[in-house]
Each structure stands twice: as C-alpha cells, then as structure tokens.
C-alpha cells in the first residue's frame, strides 16, 4: 500500500493550525470499516491520532487533532493540528493498513516572525566623532533562532565586534538582542536585520548618529 | 494451496548470523504483509517484524531492532529475515506468516526454522 | 514480559464452556482488533479467531471471541479433548507493533 506524503516540510506558524497531508489509494470495494490508520510521533513513538474499527478513535496529542472523516473514504488521511506549538515541530508518521500497509513520514516544520527591532545606544548623548559606541537591535519572539546581519549606510556588512545573543522564552519562541561596537564618524545611519531563515522575513531596524560638527586639535 | 515453507535456520555462534528463508505459494505473495514470530524453548509467541507487500514499509520488535533485517523478493515469492549480532536469548523457532490483512490475524503459518545460539 | 496479560491455565470436563480472558491496555486492545491463535503441542500456531469476533473457514462454531474496551475473551464451548492446546491473543499496538499474550494452557480433565 503506497502512503504518500509532502516531501518538503509543513511550515506552520505559531498558533495557526496546519495540515499534515498523507493519502493512499482505496482498492475497489474500500470501507471504512477495513481502515486501520495511525499518527505517531516518529522518534518517541507516541501516539497522536488513530482511526480503527470503523471509528474515529480520537486525538491522544492534547486534545489538538482531527481528521477530516468526509475524505477519509477517498484516500485522504491527512492530520488536522490546531494551534501549533515550537513543541510540536518533529517529525510524523503516518501508517495505514488495509489489506496491506504502508508508512511514511511527515515533517512540520514550526516558524513564528520577528518582531521589528528596537534600537537603543549606548551613550546616547554627547556623542562626537572617534566615540566608541554600542548599538543594541532587540527583536521579540519569533522561531526559529534569527540570522542577525549589521551594514552601514552604504550598505557595507559589519562583522567585527558583533555580540548576538539569543534566549528561548517559556514558549520556545526567541529574543534575540545583537551589539555592536562601532567608532563614530562624522555622521552614520547603523542598520540591523534580523532574519528569519524559514520564514525568509526580514525584519529591519536603524539608528542614525549625528555627530557634533568635527574637531581637531 | 496456500502453503510457507521454511529454510535457513542451525546452530551459530553468538555473535554469528544467519538467513532465514521462507518460500511462499499459493497466493499472491506480493498483496499481502508478512511477518516473523519467535518461539523460545517452552516460552510464548513473540512477534519480531512484519513487512509490507511492497516491502517498501518495515517495523522490528524492539528486541531485534538493528540487528534483524526483514526483506521480501516478491518475483520470488520469498520473505527473508537476516539475523546478525546473535545472542544466547534468541534461541528460538522462528514462524513466518502471512497476515490475511493488516491487524487481522496471521492466517497461514510456516513449519518453524530453529535457531540454535550457542558456544 | 508478554504486553498483553492471559491467565496461564484453564481446564474444563468434555462438553463444558471455557472461557480465556486477555487484557491489554488503550494502545492495543483498546484501539484494534484482538486475534486468537491456538497451538496443538508440537505444530505451528494457527489463527483461531480474528477481528475480535470472526472465525476463520474451517473453525468449529464453539470457538467465539468478544472484545469490551481494553480486553479481549475467547470462549470455547462444548469442550473436546483436541482443544487441549495453547492458546495466545494478539494485537495491534499503536507503536507500530504486534503484541502477544502470555499464552493459556488449556487441559481436558
């Protein structure tokens, strides 16, 4: 019996339900009654949903899941997960039998966006050119961890003295807070970006420095 | 009729491997699952794996996990179950059966092959 | 350590009912069917009963099974000295895998 589910991973966003699709091919003459069908998690083995004895045996994952019972006679066996969770990313395996069987396996993949960075500067007045300064970019509960990327305003990358830090909350979902130290010049806008790299959202933050007018000695 | 008859097993060493045969007939082998069931010397059936049709589909006792391996050659009609790493607790008959369907009972079952392991 | 739990005897006189109890929990019993098999001393394992209830062509009618919740039950009524035999119940198990009692000997006084 060919099981078939998405090669690529599901991307479901926090909070939102997600659909893990599986199907298989009913033979002439299928009922329901024949159907065996099992959602597990893969590597702990622990049951999620299952269908046996003509019956929708019910959700054994937190009360989150359903089928969709109107399509289970046409092949369709695919897992309904409400209100997802950081703790529900893994893998899935579907198993089917009716005469024979088969298995496959899903994987959902959990994202959630980065909130738009908040600049704040360190010192934050009196500033002249040749200052050393701290810039720091915070970005709130987003999933997975955020590639942090710093340039100037000519667009330039700034790599060197990069501080990134990141801090799972209760929930799973990421604060992250980036510095970076930088020697000012005359004028200089500082931007940061932090991505998101399942999602490919980028969220943007920047701080314009306006120095008080250059002086030599 | 519907007939499983098997071949492969003996005595080996522990640590030894073996093949274990089972020529099916009868039916057409490649609809249906089939399985493998151990019996220790005066002990209960344990069942070891099972594999789909296709063979594209396997699931092993956790017992036997990573040391068993269940294979099927359908333009045969032959199951196979390769056994490594042997150890003196797998000493046993072992069954080859066909499922009549999935989660419904075994219904055609091979002679027993033994498989004796010791030093 | 069999996952499915069965009493390890039971007897009967010829002509009497015998019934075999097999207890397993919500991820087998409770979610699939329960299959019977009897083995004749010295023979490979026979199915007996299958689908909780449903007896294989060739199976005398004194054979029935029944299932409620998490366990499953085989009654063998009118009792004849060839069921003298072992018997073993098996399922499904929502981890993927099949699970056997620990097996009931059945004697003829």
């Known amino acids: 019996l060919e099981v078939q589910v998405p090669e690529d991973p599901v991307v479901a966003l926090v909070g939102t339900d997600a659909t893990l699709c599986c199907s298989f091919s009913p033979e002439p003459g299928f009922s329901l009654a024949q159907l065996n069908l099992i959602w597990q998690l893969t590597d702990t083995k622990q049951l999620v949903h299952s269908f046996a004895e003509g019956q929708d045996q019910g959700s054994a994952y937190a009360n989150r899941t359903a089928l969709f019972p109107d399509l289970l006679a046409q092949g369709n066996a695919s897992l309904r997960l409400q209100r997802v969770r950081v703790a529900d990313e893994g893998s899935f395996t579907c198993f089917v039998s009716i005469r024979d069987f088969g298995s496959a396996a899903v994987s959902l993949q959990v994202a959630a966006p980065y909130s738009k960075p908040s600049m704040t500067l360190e010192p934050n007045k009196d500033l002249r050119p040749g200052d050393t300064v701290t810039i720091t970019c915070s970005s709130y509960r987003g999933y997975p961890e955020a590639e942090v990327f710093w340039q100037d305003g000519q667009g330039v990358p700034l790599t060197g003295n990069v501080t990134t830090s990141q801090m799972a909350n209760e929930q799973g979902l990421f604060d992250v807070h980036s510095v970076l130290r930088v020697v000012l010049g005359a004028n200089g806008t500082y931007s940061c970006l932090v991505r998101n790299p399942v999602l490919q959202q980028d969220a943007h933050g920047s701080v314009t420095i306006t120095g008080q007018p250059m002086t030599f000695p | 009729q519907v007939q499983l008859q098997q071949s492969g097993g003996g005595l080996v060493q522990p640590g030894g491997s073996l093949r274990l045969s089972c020529a099916a007939s009868?039916?057409?082998?490649?609809?249906?699952?089939m399985s493998w069931v151990r019996q220790a010397p005066g002990k209960g059936l344990e069942w070891v794996s099972v594999?789909?049709?296709?063979?594209?589909?396997?699931f092993y006792a956790d017992s036997v996990k990573g040391r068993f391996t269940i294979s099927r050659d359908n333009s045969k009609n032959t199951l196979y179950l390769q056994v490594n790493s042997l150890r003196a607790e797998d000493t046993a008959v072992y069954y080859c059966?066909?499922?009549?369907?999935?989660?419904?009972?075994?219904?055609?079952w091979g002679q027993g092959t033994t498989v004796t392991v010791s030093s | 350590q069999p996952v499915l739990t069965q009493p390890p005897s039971a007897s009967g006189t010829p002509g009497q009912r015998v019934t075999i109890s097999c207890s397993g929990s919500?991820?087998?019993?409770?979610?699939?069917?329960v299959n019977w098999y009897q083995q004749l001393p010295g023979t490979a394992p026979k199915l007996l009963i299958y689908?909780?209830?449903q007896r294989p062509s060739g199976v005398p009618d004194r054979f029935s099974g029944s299932k409620s919740g998490t366990s499953g039950s085989l009654a063998i009524s009118g009792l004849q000295s060839e069921d003298e035999a072992h018997y073993y119940c098996?399922?499904?198990?929502?981890?993927?895998?099949?699970?056997f009692g620990g097996g009931t000997k059945v004697t003829v006084l």
């Open positions: 059966a066909k499922d009549g369907r999935t989660l419904s009972g075994m219904d055609v």
């Open positions: 009868g039916f057409t082998f490649s609809s249906y699952p």
């Open positions: 594999i789909s049709g296709s063979g594209g589909s396997t």
């Open positions: 919500s991820s087998n019993i409770g979610s699939n069917p």
């Open positions: 689908n909780n209830n």
């Open positions: 098996a399922a499904w198990d929502v981890s993927l895998k099949e699970v």
